[in-house]
């Protein structure tokens, strides 16, 4: 077996020049000819110097998995997927994200303690006594108002989700 140089690849008992990123081998070199390289067609790529007969298939980012394309596929690099807005990564695969999930929605009676990021879900916290949050989107719970003195009866005690007026 030949031990080829860094910029060559083995073909039988000979060495041929590699094709550059974005190209694949259309025809191996001969005695009088160099390697014939052909550009990758749309939807395919090769990221390194190579002796490949076909370009590789670009991956596609599946919105159903909460993914969006963070780097488009080019002939020299595969696509990269990130999380769609409002989603965080649930399957981190090295420097790729394989699947994302929508942020949790805080319930009424809770506040958003920490907003979601690409790697972490929204963190919700129950409102402390005497405060309320009617829709769960607030960063701070609101203080309930006391009933006016001319009302004969109080409509009911306040809850962390709703206030009585």
């Amino acid at each position: 077996l030949p031990s080829c140089k860094e910029d060559e690849y083995p073909v039988g008992s000979e060495c041929c020049p590699k094709c550059g990123p974005g190209f694949h081998v259309r025809q191996a070199c001969g005695e009088q000819t160099g390697t014939v390289c052909e550009p990758c067609s749309p939807g395919t790529y090769i990221a390194h110097f190579n002796g490949l007969s076909k370009c590789l298939q670009c991956q596609m980012c599946d919105p159903a998995m909460g993914l969006r394309t963070s780097r488009n596929c080019s002939t020299t690099a595969n696509a990269l997927c990130g999380c769609s807005p409002g989603h965080f990564c649930i399957i981190q695969d090295g420097d790729h994200c394989a699947a994302c999930r929508a942020y949790a929605t805080s319930s009424p009676g809770q506040r958003v303690q920490k907003g979601g990021t690409e790697s972490q879900d929204t963190l919700c916290q129950n409102c402390p006594p005497g405060t309320f949050s009617s829709n769960g989107t607030l960063e701070e719970c609101q203080h309930g108002t006391k009933c006016s003195k001319w009302l004969v009866t109080e409509a009911g005690p306040g809850t962390s989700s709703f206030r009585w007026v």
């Epitope: 083995p10 490949l52 298939q57 980012c61 695969d93």
Partner: antibody, heavy 119, light 106 residues
Framework: QIQLVQSGPELKKPGETVKISCKAS????????MNWVKQAPGKGLKWMGW????????TYADAFKGRFAFSLETSASTAYLQINNLKNEDTATYFC????????????WGQGTSVTVSS | QIVLTQSPAILSASPGEKVTMTCSAS?????MHWYQRKSGTSPKRWIY???KLASGVPARFSGSGSGTSYSLTISSMEAEDAATYYC?????????FGAGTKLELK
């Protein structure tokens, strides 16, 4: 979660045909290339080739040109490996494996399908 | 084709011991990938692009190398690391695997 589930073991006679299935779930089959790998008893892993699941175009390693065929049924999220005119040396476990990343490593593998060829 | 030679073929290590296995390519390759396989199961991605750990792989594993010489190292052997490890290249066709290094617990 992402899974590649292969069809069950096969016992065949020389000259017959076998068709192995690989059903993808948890992702869209056509979003990633699919590879096929052979492991004969007591031997190492041997790459058979791959199929571009978007275009349907197969690529075969030299040792697997002729009697071997990769195909797809995208509506069923399934890739297939068919081996025609079976020979004793085709006795092996066959794996499907998804190509992933910038330099294509195999991130998910099927559980393997054992094919035994014996008269 | 590029032949990948893994050494040693069999390696025995005690818990806590540092382990190194190598993968030598017959011609220069751009990247090396590694898989772990336990008996009766399919291979698992383990290290990709020479040195990046796949999801769920313990930090005691590392990969390095360039050109024709690559290695996988475990800083401190644990019982669950006993398995066969395969290297793989696809710088040129055909894609090839090494014959594997079987790592046993001493």
């Amino acid at each position: 979660q992402i899974q590649l589930v292969q069809s069950g073991p096969e016992l065949k006679k020389p000259g017959e045909t076998v068709k192995i299935s690989c059903k993808a779930s948890g992702y869209i089959l056509t979003n990633y290339g699919m590879n096929w790998v052979k492991q004969a008893p007591g031997k190492g892993l041997k790459w058979m080739g791959w199929i571009n699941t978007y275009t349907g175009e197969p690529t075969y390693a030299d040792a697997f040109k002729g009697r071997f065929a990769f195909s797809l049924e995208t509506s069923a999220s399934t890739a297939y490996l068919q081996i025609n005119n079976l020979k004793n040396e085709d006795t092996a476990t066959y794996f499907c494996a998804r190509g992933y990343g910038n330099h294509w490593y195999f991130d998910y593998w099927g559980q393997g399908t054992s094919v035994t060829v014996s008269s | 084709q590029i032949v990948l030679t893994q050494s040693p073929a069999i390696l025995s290590a005690s818990p806590g011991e540092k382990v190194t296995m190598t993968c030598s390519a017959s011609s220069s390759v751009s990247y090396m990938h590694w898989y772990q396989r336990k008996s009766g199961t399919s291979p698992k991605r383990w290290i990709y692009d020479t040195s990046k750990l796949a999801s769920g792989v313990p930090a005691r594993f590392s990969g390095s190398g360039s050109g024709t010489s690559y290695s996988l190292t475990i800083s401190s052997m644990e019982a669950e690391d006993a398995a066969t490890y395969y290297c793989q290249q696809w710088t040129s066709d055909p894609l090839t695997f090494g014959a594997g290094t079987k790592l046993e617990l001493k």
